[in-house]
Amino acid sequence: HHHHHHHPIPDSSPLLQFGGQVRQRYLYTDDAQQTEAHLEIREDGTVGGAAHESPESLLELKALKPGVIEILGVKTSRFLCQKPDGALYGSLHFDPEACSFRELLLENGYNVYESEAHGLPLHLPGNKSPHRDPASEGPARFLPLPGLPPAPPEPPGILAPEPPDVGSSDPLSMVGPSEARSPSYAS
């Protein structure tokens, strides 16, 4: 297993970088298992790697605040979350402590993701040693590949177009700096 030593660009903001609050991406990694894989969140809540892009590997990356995102599986409507030992799982409900990730940009176009609460790096589960400690490895790098393009606009019809939706359910305006861990039972 190769450990890549990259230097994250500090204070990266997905909002500033991508100019949007929500991005659909495939998270491709080529160093998690020495094989190419796309992170996928499955219907049963397990998280793994798919050799090719799949419906389960299409993810929605949504900015919660500068540099911090939530990751949602589009097909399964499950959030990518991380246990305190670094293991990944997919949850139907969002917990700020388990499911918020800091997004760190590398110079080569790859990103590193780490739990905002625990600082543990996001890794695909390894095939080689299933009983490994996920927290003991260096960060895995992910290349965010563009997801499906937005649907083309409907051809002009009889009805007048609706006004643009300027509202947002994104809690950016509500979320302040994270000074402490979310409430939980420490483990």
Epitope: D44, G45, T46, K65, C81, K83, P84, D85, A87, Y89, S91, L92, H93, F94, D95, P96, E97, A98, C99, P171, M174, V175, G176, P177, S178, E179, A180, R181, S182, P183, S184, Y185, A186, S187
Partner: antibody, heavy 120, light 112 residues
Framework: EVHLVESGGGLVQPGRSLRLSCVAS????????MHWVRQVPGKGLEWVSV????????GYADSVKGRFTISRDNAKNSLFLQVSSLRAEDTALYYC?????????????WGQGTLVTVSS | DIVMTQSPLSLPVTPGEPASISCRSS???????????LDWYLQKPGQSPQLLIY???TRASGVPDRFSGSGSGTDFTLKISRVEAEDVGVYYC?????????FGGGTKVEIK
């Protein structure tokens, strides 16, 4: 689909003990905290106890501390509540509930409950 | 412990009309991470509670969008935009900020 089935309730005399069980299916059991919440029939809800995903941390309501013991067996997808030194005021429907995350406080799915009646 | 107070105790509603339930906590439920740790549950007659809203305003999986949660700090509101017959039951708020989690006394919603 999340499924939680409680068992072990029944009629018991004051001062005696019972062991409540909850079998979980439809989700990866060891990814989540688990809770017990109780409800006196016709009354409101009272949180009883929680155990984190790996049994690393446990919490109890003051009203049951020292008398109730929560535990889990992740290999068997099972949650337990050992209830001892029972009192009349422990009479309630006991719900097993899945936590929202490995350590989180919010229960998001509940079982149908098992009724404990403490009476002489 | 944090004390949760709900009002009204009982709420007669007309199908198709809006309804609103209030919940007040004895201390702020706003965490330093910016989230309010306030949940809403519905217990339908003869059933176990089901999660409707968590983190103050986030709808739980499968919950119809006629349900919405709002508020911050110590004052919270659950709104049903258009009540349906299946919405009857007892609604509880619960604080999830600290141990022990505590519930409000409940609001019984019934059809007029």
């Amino acid at each position: 689909e999340v499924h939680l089935v409680e068992s072990g309730g029944g009629l018991v005399q004051p001062g005696r003990s019972l062991r409540l069980s909850c079998v979980a299916s439809g989700f990866t059991f060891d990814d989540y905290a688990m809770h017990w919440v109780r409800q006196v029939p016709g009354k409101g809800l009272e949180w009883v106890s929680v155990i984190t995903w790996n049994s690393g941390s446990i919490g109890y309501a003051d009203s049951v501390k020292g008398r109730f013991t929560i535990s889990r067996d992740n290999a068997k997808n099972s949650l337990f509540l050992q209830v001892s030194s029972l009192r009349a005021e422990d009479t309630a429907l006991y719900y097993c509930a899945k936590g929202i995350s490995p350590t989180g406080t919010t229960p998001d799915y509940w079982g149908q409950g098992t009724l404990v009646t403490v009476s002489s | 412990d944090i004390v949760m107070t709900q009002s009204p105790l009982s709420l007669p509603v007309t199908p198709g009309e809006p309804a609103s339930i209030s919940c007040r906590s004895s201390q702020s439920l706003l965490h330093s991470n910016g989230y309010n740790y306030l949940d809403w549950y519905l217990q339908k007659p003869g059933q176990s509670p089901q999660l409707l809203i968590y983190l103050g305003s986030t709808r739980a999986s499968g919950v119809p969008d006629r349900f919405s949660g709002s508020g911050s700090g110590t004052d919270f509101t659950l709104k049903i935009s258009r009540v349906e017959a299946e919405d009857v039951g007892v609604y509880y708020c619960m604080q999830a900020l600290q141990t022990p989690p505590t519930f409000g006394g409940g609001t019984k919603v019934e059809i007029k």
